[in-house]
């Protein structure tokens, strides 16, 4: 920044430093040289002289003005002409920005990733505001009425060993920045409620070549969580349509989900679980591809999922840029 | 000020019900989380339910499928309907904003064996 230079006089902004973009602003400079009466004063945005808008207020003060000022970050600096000075001299600068208030936090969000040990707390933050924004996250507990409060820029990870008020709490975010303060909804929630599975993976397929050809989809997960429920979607790669499957699954066993597919196409699988009856779902797992034979039987498994010459052997590839598919990792 | 003002308490026989209601000033009720809590003699004071702005809601194990919480946003009122009453669940019934600390004097509630 330009901030820690030595003055010759000062300068400043109206209405303020950091303001609302779009405003019009008026940056004064006031110099202060000895033996300088300045001749004429100078701005100087990002390095660049400003030609217009400049209007002499008095023998040592200027005032630069702009209108429907757009952008974030700016250095502003001044300098005078000086008789008998060869150089212009500097006066002061000064780094100003500009950005919105922060919008209403909405949709936050707290879950517990089985074995993490944390909960993850996530919001929307509304547009973009270019400046310096933090976030407080409240937690506090409905049991005991104690409250933690945490500082963040995005989201927050608080250890589950710190949640030490019970199981119910109360969640609510509060933004801020130096044009505005919002605070979010509060959310209301039970720790045992919104703990995610340990992720679900698909690790194989094969095709069985039975009378009717049959694909049988391998797929676990670490969970210890007894009553889980899981939906396994998959498409043609080249349609835009999912089939979903659901199941009820107990995860003491590898899994083995079957399913009838037309011959020589190329399909694509994920998998998703939640604990049963609960409010939110792990992200889609990662795509896994599988090509169905012509007729003879074939296994493609994850060790395999990247693109391989057609030789007889397995075909099976995997390139997650080639797909429009909605494969946010969406928890809600 | 917010006022938080409870009622509808009274003595009651074991396996009878009784609905508590709280009247809040202003729009608190459209815009938090209401709560209600109980402080028999002797005892902390113990969250019963809660309920948020979408109408989910929170209970305490002790209570979970014979008490009920809800809420009229546009009567600024909070309600607790209380069924197959305990004798342990005498005690002051107390209407609260978490998110802020504001409480209500209480209302009375005893059921008697």
């Known amino acids: 920044g330009i901030t820690n230079i030595n003055c010759s006089g000062h300068i400043w902004v109206e209405p303020a430093t950091i303001f609302k973009m779009g405003m019009n602003i008026s940056i004064y400079c006031q110099a202060a040289i000895k033996n300088c009466q300045p001749r004429k004063l100078h701005f100087y945005k990002n390095g660049i002289k400003e030609r217009f808008q400049i209007t002499r207020i008095n023998k040592t003060t200027a005032r630069l003005w702009y209108k429907n000022f757009l952008e974030p970050h700016a250095s502003m600096y001044c300098t005078a002409e000086c008789p008998k000075h060869f150089q212009e001299t500097l006066i002061c600068g000064k780094d100003i920005s500009s950005g919105y208030p922060p919008d209403i936090p909405d949709e936050v969000t707290c879950v517990i990733y089985e074995y993490s040990g944390n909960m993850t707390c996530t919001w929307n933050a509304g547009k973009l505001t270019y400046i310096d924004t933090k976030y407080v996250v409240h937690v506090k507990s409905l049991e005991t009425e104690e409250e933690q409060q945490y500082l963040t820029s995005s989201y927050i990870n608080i250890s589950t060993d710190s949640l030490q008020g019970g199981k119910k709490y109360l969640v609510w975010v509060q933004a801020a920045n130096a044009l505005g303060m919002e605070e979010s909804k509060q959310l209301q929630i039970h720790l045992d409620d919104i703990v995610i599975p340990s992720a679900a993976v698909i690790s194989r397929a094969e095709t069985i070549n039975a009378t009717v050809p049959k694909t049988i989809i391998y797929w676990d997960s670490q969970t210890t969580i007894e009553k889980v429920s899981c939906e396994m979607r998959y498409k043609a790669t080249t349609n835009q349509t999912w089939n979903v499957k659901e199941f009820d699954t107990n995860f003491t066993y590898v899994q083995q989900s079957e399913f009838y597919l037309e011959p020589n196409i190329k399909y694509v699988f994920q998998v998703r679980c939640q604990e049963t009856g609960k409010r939110y779902w792990q992200p889609w797992s990662s795509l896994f591809f599988h090509k169905t034979p012509e007729t003879v039987p074939q296994v493609t498994s994850k060790a395999f999922q990247h693109d391989t010459w057609n030789s007889g052997l397995t075909v099976a590839s995997i390139s997650t840029g080639h797909l429009t598919s909605d494969n946010r990792g969406d928890i809600g | 000020e917010v006022q938080l003002v409870e009622s509808g308490g009274g003595l009651v026989q074991a396996g009878g019900s009784l609905r508590v209601s709280c009247l809040a000033s202003g729009n608190i009720v459209s815009r938090n989380v209401m709560a209600w809590y109980r402080q028999a003699p002797g005892k902390q004071r113990e969250l019963v339910a809660s309920v948020d702005t979408g109408g989910s809601t929170l209970y305490a194990d002790s209570v979970k499928g014979r008490f009920t919480i809800s809420r009229d946003s546009a009567k600024s009122m909070v309600y607790l309907q209380m069924n197959s009453l305990k004798p342990e669940d005498t005690a002051v019934y107390y209407c609260?904003?978490?998110?802020?600390?504001?409480w209500g004097q209480g209302t009375q509630v005893t059921v008697s064996s």
């Open positions: 609260n904003v978490p998110r802020y600390g504001y």
